[in-house]
């Protein structure tokens, strides 16, 4: 039965003397006559065992103190503590000759803990110990006694225990205390990982390489590996492992995040509170759930708040110009707590007789500087239909609008179109060239816009390079120019009127006059 | 067991000698000292000095010095207390006692049973 | 020469009771003191040595205490076997008994 006695974390004790409760009963050699347990009282007048023997009378003592067996719990290599009192052989009279002031400390391997005599010839010697000069006085009852504490240790050990034993050769001694212990470096956690109870090597100077393994809720970024040293220390921290999202670093332990918080990697970050307009109801949580009607877009971070899509644009004002028109507008009230605010045009075409029976407007309607994504807050639409209703809706987006698409994010504005002019005449041919005409016919334009009143042909030598032109008007869609040079290069354009004015020119035609007469049909290519 | 054993009591005349005798028995005779103690009719203990048992070297108190003398026969185990020149004063218990020497301090802790020297004319 | 005094010359105790006895040296003799128990006809028993440690088969009922010149004998609670002379002793240059101290029965 052994008390309790408070010992380093990093020290196994496998054997106590002071711990014992009772006779220790180890065996002396000779059985009568040399050690002598003796029961002492200590501070606390609790009985300490202890062993003693002082024949110092006599020359060439030889009087061994054998422990009982000591299991070696897989250590390799153990330390003897010996706390023992010796007295000083001058405090005795008449004994100079014969009196010793040191004593031997022997071990012996043995896989057999019922060895009942001590076979001396077994025992390897650990040491000859002597009683160190700066010694601690310890108050044993009331006298101070001059107590030495010596540390010795042995190693490698291989068998499954061993006998210590102490020899005395004419020494006043006493055995105070015997403690023998190993050394370990105790279960810890750094940098996450946990290391095992670790028993040290054999050698004084030898490392044992330990793999930790990392706490719960953790994993590994790096192998986690420490080294245990000869005296129990942990050394030289390698790796780490971090807290699983949704768990963060408290005493070495990763705890789940609080209510109201998440963490969303792996990393060695603390949880954080949950941002604006989002939750969290369960501990652990990796992310926060959006509040009612606020969103995440894909590449939004855990970490940013959850947002919303953008009121509508403000303030939405409309400037007609015959089939183009001008739209402006002011940046929403609400933007839904994000910069990605852009803008999209939608154009619905609109039949006069029932403004509700609208169309898409189709490919044909221009905006500039684009249709949709529009960073600014204007926009030109042309290449309208004159006389034509259009609505024109703005919408305002932003990087959640698709979750939750609502006519709120939209501001419209219905125009009717002007007359206007036509547009440009896409087919300009050459009929007939001869040396001092040509003969030019031409379609229709595309858009009209109305009733063609005329066709204005404009003309000049290609060398004036339209410093000096002529114009011919006709309603019809040809016409000869005659009076030209001949052996000479015209360019003409021509172009259509209505009520509205003129469309624009043509793309130019280039004709060389002959210089003999012939007859050529054109489609539009340079004619010689 | 460790006994020491002494002689029966002694008459002696003034002026007589004697020579009490302790046997040791039950350990190594040389490897503890000696001591006599003497206790007058009535009076407490009076030590006297003592023997080291393996040179032979006596320590001889104040007052006993001169008509007494320690002295042994190892082949026998034996110590002995010889008293010359006996005066009546010198009747009382004469006791050898076993010294022993530990870490902790000394004492006398085995005792013989005593011997009475009576000195009378 | 070192001279020990104990006290009380005599001490009457009722069995059971608790008896303590003194010894005083005239100079210091550390922690070194012996005392012994004597009945009438015997010879003397060693009862504490070191001032303070019992021999194998002494009863735990006697403890010792002190160091320097006071010393003290204690007997937790006195036994009819008990009844007897108590002397210490000193292991200066020269060893002395004090006068002793008679334990007998009130």
């Known amino acids: 039965v052994t008390g309790s006695r408070v010992y380093p974390a990093n020290e196994v004790t496998l054997l106590d003397s002071r711990s014992v409760q009772g006779e220790l009963g180890w065996i002396a050699s000779p059985l009568e006559g040399g050690w002598e347990e003796v029961s002492i009282m200590d501070e606390k007048n609790t009985p300490i065992r202890t062993y003693q023997v002082c024949n110092v009378m006599e020359a060439s003592q030889n009087n061994w103190l054998r422990t009982d067996w000591i299991t070696r719990e897989g250590a390799q290599r153990v330390y003897i503590e010996i706390k023992f009192t010796l007295r000083d052989c001058n405090s005795l009279p008449g004994v100079m000759g014969t009196c010793k002031e040191t004593f031997n400390l022997y071990y012996y391997e043995s896989d057999n803990d019922k060895e009942r005599f001590i076979r001396e010839s077994q025992f390897g010697k650990i040491d000859t110990i002597a009683a160190d000069e700066s010694f601690t006085q310890v108050d044993i009852g009331d006298r101070i006694m001059k107590l030495n504490t010596e540390i010795r240790d042995v190693g490698p050990l291989s068998k499954k225990g061993f006998y210590l034993a102490f020899q005395d050769v004419g020494a006043c001694i006493a055995l105070v205390s015997v403690r023998v212990f190993y050394k370990k470096c105790p279960l810890t956690v750094r940098n996450l990982a946990q290391f095992p109870d670790t028993i040290t090597g054999a050698d004084t100077s030898s490392l044992v390489e330990v793999r930790g393994s990392c706490v719960n809720n953790s994993e590994e970024k790096d192998v986690p590996k420490m080294y245990c040293g000869a005296d129990g220390e942990w050394l030289v921290p390698i790796g780490n492992c971090l807290c699983n999202a949704g768990h963060e670093e408290q005493n070495g332990e990763c705890q789940a995040c609080k209510i109201g918080y998440y963490k969303a990697l792996s990393t060695d970050a603390s949880c954080a509170k949950c941002p604006p307009h989002s939750y969290s109801v369960w501990e652990g949580a990796t992310s926060c759930t959006c509040d009612r009607g606020f969103f995440r877009a894909d590449n939004d971070a855990a970490s940013m708040p959850c947002t919303r899509p953008p009121s509508a644009p403000l303030n939405l004002i409309s400037n007609v110009n015959e089939t183009s028109v001008n739209l402006e507008w002011s940046s929403p009230q609400n933007t839904g707590g994000r910069q990605d605010i852009s803008y999209n045009v939608v154009c619905k075409k609109c039949g006069a007789g029932d403004p509700s029976k609208c169309r898409p407007c189709g490919s044909g309607v221009h905006y500039t500087p684009q249709q949709n994504g529009l960073k600014t807050t204007r926009v030109s639409i042309t290449d309208l239909l004159a006389h034509t209703n259009y609505t024109f809706e703005i919408w305002a987006v932003n990087g959640v609008s698709k979750y939750n698409p609502s006519p709120d994010q939209s501001v419209s504005v219905t125009v009717t179109t002007n007359q206007a002019a036509p547009s440009s005449i896409a087919l300009v041919q050459a009929k007939e060239v001869t040396r001092y005409s040509v003969a030019l016919a031409w379609l229709e334009p595309d858009r009209p816009n109305g009733v063609i009143l005329e066709y204005e042909v404009k003309y000049y030598e290609k060398d004036q390079n339209e410093r000096s032109y002529r114009i011919v008007r006709t309603a019809a869609r040809n016409t000869d120019i005659k009076g030209l040079n001949p052996l000479t290069s015209y360019v003409f354009h021509v172009r259509a009127r209505t009520a509205a004015g003129y469309g624009d020119f043509s793309e130019p035609l280039e004709v060389t006059t002959n210089t003999v007469p012939s007859r050529i049909i054109g489609d539009g290519a340079n004619s010689t | 067991q460790v006994q020491l054993l002494q002689s029966g009591a002694e008459v002696k005349k003034p002026g007589a000698s004697v020579k009490v005798p302790c046997k040791a028995s039950?350990?190594?005779?040389?490897?503890?000292?000696m001591s006599w103690v003497r206790q007058a009719p009535g009076q407490g203990l009076e030590w006297m000095g003592w023997?080291?048992?393996?040179?032979?070297?006596?320590t001889y108190a104040q007052g006993f010095t001169g008509r007494f003398v320690f002295s042994l026969d190892t082949s026998v185990s034996t110590a002995y207390l010889q008293i010359s020149s006996l005066k009546a004063e010198d009747t009382a218990v004469y006791y050898c006692?076993?010294?022993?020497?530990?870490?902790?301090?000394?004492?006398?802790?085995?005792w013989g049973q005593g011997t009475l020297v009576t000195v009378s004319s | 020469e070192i001279v020990l005094t104990q006290s009380p010359a005599t001490l009457s105790v009722s069995p059971g009771e608790r008896a303590t006895l003194s010894c005083r040296a005239s100079?210091?003799?550390?922690?070194?003191l012996p005392w012994y128990q004597q009945k009438p006809g015997q010879a003397p028993r060693l009862l504490i040595y070191?001032?303070?440690t019992r021999p194998t088969g002494i009863p735990d009922r006697f403890s010792a205490s002190g160091s320097g010149t006071d010393f003290t004998l204690t007997i937790s609670r006195v036994e009819p076997e008990d009844f007897a002379v108590y002397y210490c002793?000193?292991?200066?240059?020269?060893?002395?008994f004090g006068q002793g101290t008679k334990v007998e029965i009130k």
């Open positions: 006692a076993r010294v022993r020497f530990t870490v902790y301090g000394d004492g006398m802790d085995v």
């Open positions: 100079q210091s003799v550390s922690s070194n």
């Open positions: 039950g350990y190594t005779f040389t490897s503890r000292a």
């Open positions: 002793q000193q292991y200066g240059p020269s060893w002395t």
């Open positions: 070191g001032a303070s």
């Open positions: 023997i080291n048992t393996n040179t032979g070297n006596p």
